[in-house]
């Protein structure tokens, strides 16, 4: 087989589900040609003259299509076909986890397009255009520095997305304070308190991304439960990075998480990584088998009764 030196294949984008006709370059309609995709011959019944006709395009139709002159196997034309979809309205959100330094915006498409997309973000503070610096690691995120703190002027962030098959856009408008949401507290550790079978000592650290905890203090929200129960108990703490749980069940493993929020503005962070701990238990005594079984039954039964002071709520429901 002889192949002619060709320019790069013609790149063509077509919509999923559509029909497409691929011409064999500028070959005449009645030229005798053969088509291949990714090196595999295609059935002659897909041809209309020298053109290749594909119905109901699927993702699997993407590939390198080549037509050859049937007698000489001379490569006549190549098409790199990409099957995809136009973008739907992008999902855009902005958040300040480094208040008062700035905020970031991130975006994604609700459904894949299967082909390359180009995003363009513009940020306005009133009528002033602000720079959104691309995140070095995350391609769907950019960062904006706050120029004026406690500004009453709204921010408007717009994003447009386009690909070879279409275009879409969305925008959000917000006040500076509404998007403040710290990162979760870090290094959450829970430890048993010696000789205290109902206590667990929990410590954590302010998120390292929060730049100025002195000027912009955080409050915290702690939730905990024994692994065998589904209901959480909650404690809200106005300051400090430690708390002692005093109503734990003896001998039961607990899961503990902490969330953070600026004292005055914004919303609660997501929950921290879970810490696990079991309250202190005495060294086991040597018991008879019957007594051991009775004790196990008693302890299991009592562990299912929730403490009388249980408070069930979620940080997301709390006001500032």
């Amino acid at each position: 087989q002889r192949h002619s030196p060709q320019e790069a294949p013609h790149v063509q984008y077509e919509r999923l589900g559509s029909d497409v006709t691929l011409p064999c370059g500028t070959a005449n309609w009645d030229a005798a040609v053969t088509w291949r995709v990714n090196g595999t011959d295609l059935a002659p019944d897909l041809l209309n003259g020298s053109q290749l006709v594909l119905h109901g395009l699927e993702l699997g139709h993407s590939g390198l299509y080549a037509c050859f002159h049937r007698d000489s196997w001379h490569l006549r034309h190549q098409v790199l076909l990409h099957v995809g979809l136009p973008p739907r309205e992008p999902v855009l959100s902005c958040r300040s986890n480094t208040y008062p330094k700035g905020f970031y915006c991130s975006w994604h498409l609700p459904t894949p397009t299967y082909i390359p997309n180009t995003f363009n973000v513009t940020v306005l503070h009133g009528s002033k255009i602000m720079v959104c610096e691309k995140d070095p690691a995350l391609k769907n995120r950019c960062h904006i520095r706050y120029m004026h703190l406690f500004s009453t002027i709204k921010y408007k962030v717009s994003i447009s997305v386009s690909n070879a098959l279409g275009h879409n856009a969305t925008a959000i408008t917000f006040d500076e304070f509404t998007i403040v949401k710290p990162d979760p507290p870090e290094n959450v550790v829970a430890r048993p308190v010696p000789s205290n079978p109902r206590r667990l000592e929990v410590t954590w650290q302010t998120p390292s991304t929060w730049p100025d905890p002195e000027s912009f203090p955080l409050k915290f929200f702690l939730r905990y439960r024994p692994l065998i129960l589904d209901q959480w108990q909650h404690v809200e703490l106005s300051d400090g990075t430690a708390h002692t749980i005093t109503d734990a069940y003896a001998g039961k493993e607990y899961i503990i998480q902490v969330a953070a929020k600026d004292n005055e503005i914004g919303t609660w962070s997501d929950w921290s990584v879970a810490a696990h701990a079991t309250p202190w238990t005495e060294e086991p005594r040597h018991l008879t088998t019957e007594a051991q079984a009775a004790e196990t039954t008693t302890s299991t039964t009592s562990s299912l009764a929730p403490p009388p002071t249980t408070k069930i709520c979620d940080p997301g429901e709390l006001g500032s």
């Epitope: 030196p5 011409p23 500028t26 309609w29 003259g49 006549r76």
Partner: antibody, heavy 120, light 108 residues
Framework: QVQLVESGGDVVQPGRSLRLSCAAS????????MHWVRQPPGKGLEWVTI????????YYADSVKGRFTISRDNSKNTVFLQMNSLRTEDTGFYYC?????????????WGQGTLVTVSS | DIQMTQSPSSLSASVGDRVTITCRAS??????LNWYQQKPGKAPKLLIY???SLQSGVPSRFSGSGSGTDFTLTISSLQPEDFATYYC??????????FGQGTRLEIK
């Protein structure tokens, strides 16, 4: 019998526009890729442009890219060459030609040519 | 783009002579070469396609040969009507289609 008849050649000033036509008969026009080939006075042949049988594919020589546009009307068996921003070096005979369906492709049918003169 | 170079650019010969015109491609074009004859004031006319195939209606004194980069058009016995300009043209990698600069054949 097969005929290709070009028209529209004229004397024009540099920077002006001109539209050439080529009327075809005697063959199934809508099956054929159509070319324009030009020849400056006393010089050789230069390929200018091609349009595929259905008009979906168009290619141009670098010397005319962005200035010339080829089009066709299969219902009227006619191919056109719109020439804008004409230069003195565009002067010459312009031939339309139908390409062969066999490979290698060659110019199977030719018109008699129409003269374009670009001069101030 | 593939460049086509013809030689000689002109030549003088007599009726009955055997004449050879050569055409060289800047890269291999297999056998995808065509030869045309053009007389003054007329459109070109195809003589040979695919390097060596004689177009229908063309006298058998015309022949073509070659493959790769070097090609020849031979007229075995020149006739008065053969005095014209001859062009080679490649169809290997197109577009663009490229012609040789032409060889003018004159009566000696």
């Amino acid at each position: 019998q097969v005929q290709l008849v070009e028209s529209g050649g004229d004397v024009v000033q540099p920077g002006r526009s001109l539209r050439l036509s080529c009327a075809a008969s005697g063959f199934t026009f809508s099956y054929y890729g159509m070319h324009w080939v030009r020849q400056p006075p006393g010089k050789g042949l230069e390929w200018v442009t091609i349009i595929s049988f259905d008009g979906s594919q168009k290619y141009y020589a670098d010397s005319v890219k962005g200035r010339f546009t080829i089009s066709r009307d299969n219902s009227k068996n006619t191919v056109f060459l719109q020439m804008n921003s004409l230069r003195t070096e565009d002067t010459g005979f312009y031939y339309c030609a139908a390409q062969s369906s066999t490979w290698p492709e060659y110019f199977q049918y030719w018109g008699q040519g129409t003269l374009v003169t670009v001069s101030s | 783009d593939i460049q086509m170079t013809q030689s000689p650019s002109s030549l003088s010969a007599s009726v009955g002579d055997r004449v050879t015109i050569t055409c060289r491609a800047s890269q291999s074009i297999s056998s995808y070469l065509n030869w045309y004859q053009q007389k003054p004031g007329k459109a070109p006319k195809l003589l040979i396609y695919a390097a060596s195939s004689l177009q229908s209606g063309v006298p058998s004194r015309f022949s073509g040969s070659g493959s790769g980069t070097d090609f020849t058009l031979t007229i075995s016995s020149l006739q008065p009507e053969d005095f014209a300009t001859y062009y080679c043209q490649q169809s290997y990698s197109t577009p663009p289609i490229t012609f040789g600069q032409g060889t003018r054949l004159e009566i000696k």
